[in-house]
Amino acid sequence: DVERTTCPPEKEVHEIDESLIFYKKRELEACVDAALLAAQMDRVDAIPFTYEQLDVLKHKLDELYPQGYPESVIRHLGHLFLKMSPEDIRKWNVTSLETLKALLKVSKGHEMSAQVATLIDRVVVGRGQLDKDTVDTLTAFCPGCLCSLSPERLSSVPPSVIGAVRPQDLDTCGPRQLDVLYPKARLAFQNMSGSEYFVKIRPFLGGAPTEDVKALSQQNVSMDLATFMKLRREAVLPLTVAEVQKLLGPHVEGLKVEEQHSPVRDWILKQRQDDLDTLGLGLQGGIPNGYLILDLSVREALS
């Protein structure tokens, strides 16, 4: 912890200015008033402080605002944001997208995924929902950050906002997040024609149930392998060989390359080998001819 000393008269700080880079840690601690610092936070980022000096300034703000910084301070944190932990950020209440933009810019090029995720979470909580302006800000300043939100937070996205989401914004989304986003996307794009609908819904298909995937197989969509590989395992397993063939169209040949990877591997294990042979791809591992398949889970459910 920073040792407490009294401030020498000639070092007294009446304004946050560029002279402070020449102060030692203990001088900063003794001579900078926390309230003055908070009031003049907008000056801090223009001054090339050392990381050690920034630690002292953070310590002062922490003492002044033990319950969390006000947004007037947060907005002007600048490089001091790099010193914040997710625990610090959890105490904040942020509603301004200007604040979000400013801090996202600062975090660029630094390993701050946990802090950024927490910040975005606080913005969504502060604004009450994940509205279009917030989504637009995230997609513009932090591609991929949408996926840092929990499924619970994502559930506050109105379907009308889904159109603002680009495919690359969903690249890092996990199954649980896509489970939340897919029904919203389905609703948002429901009035589109077949091919246009598929283009729009494709990035969200990792959250699609079996029946929707089956429906797509009837629409000549020619799903690419990358999209197929992102489908939920549970959505793929019930598909027949014929349905997968129709779903993938000319891309069906790619199954051979992905033969050892989930969900293709798991799907192969559920298919009859002679059905797989009809694809002419040399896929191996299906159920041999003449074998009977007992679904024990059904029996257990009945007993």
């Epitope: 304004e15 200015d17 560029e18 001054i47």
Partner: antibody
């Protein structure tokens, strides 16, 4: 454009004090620090001190007890006061702007200087 | 205080030649923030000093590219690739990493 102009008494008697004013234009003293530098005839530059945007000061260690720098932002003026002058304080005195933003504390613009002779 | 030692004190050159001035500091000029606040100034006869190079190697606006600065830590160099008449004068290095700021004693560039 950026300009700095020093004005001083020219001649000071030994043991008396010196007051010089630096009047600036083209920028604000609330955004830039000002350094004072002197140069004895035929010699090198000696940094005297600086007044920062917030009004704080730093001084040359050897001259600290004799120097005082202040400013009036509204009048765009910086003042140098130096006490107990001796003949070896005879020099040309310059004020210069410290650009801490883009140029990182370098003195990017200088006044033309004012000549001070200490003599009885 | 940081002592800045410049060599040589006087540097006679022929026009068109390369000139090199050395500046050494008594302690490292790397600030805790990672910047090195070492600057070069030129004072032509009868004029005020003018900024040439800031932060070791950055040319100030309007300074010709025949001027270049290099170095790190405590050792720095100013090079003029082809000396012209207008380059004659006294060159000073200066540090603003530590307060008080200090200047080197100067190097006079003159015609051989």
């Amino acid at each position: 454009q950026v300009q700095l102009k020093e004005s001083g008494p020219g001649l000071v008697a030994p043991s008396q004090s010196l007051s010089i004013t630096c009047t600036v234009s083209g920028f604000s003293l609330s955004s830039y620090a000002i350094s004072w530098v002197r140069q004895p005839p035929g010699k090198g530059l000696e940094w005297l001190g600086v007044i920062w945007t917030g009004g704080g000061t730093n001084y040359n260690s050897a001259l600290k007890s004799r120097l005082s720098i202040s400013k009036d932002n509204s009048k765009s003026q910086v003042f140098l006061k130096m006490n107990s002058l001796q003949t070896d304080d005879t020099a040309r005195f310059y004020c210069a702007r410290n650009n801490y933003g883009r140029l990182d504390y370098a003195m990017d613009y200088w006044g033309q200087g004012t000549s001070v002779t200490v003599s009885s | 205080d940081v002592v800045m030692t410049q060599t040589p004190l006087s540097l006679p050159v022929s026009l068109g030649d390369q000139a090199s001035i050395s500046c050494r500091s008594s302690q490292s000029l790397v600030h805790g923030n990672g910047n090195t606040y070492l600057h070069w100034y030129l004072q032509k006869p009868g004029q005020s000093p003018k900024l040439l190079i800031y932060k070791v190697s950055n040319r100030f606006s309007g300074v010709p590219d025949r001027f270049s600065g290099s170095g790190s830590g405590t050792d720095f160099t100013l090079k003029i690739s082809r000396v012209e008449t207008e380059d004659l004068g006294v060159y000073f290095c200066s540090q603003s990493t530590h307060v008080p700021f200090t200047f080197g004693s100067g190097t006079k560039l003159e015609i051989k």
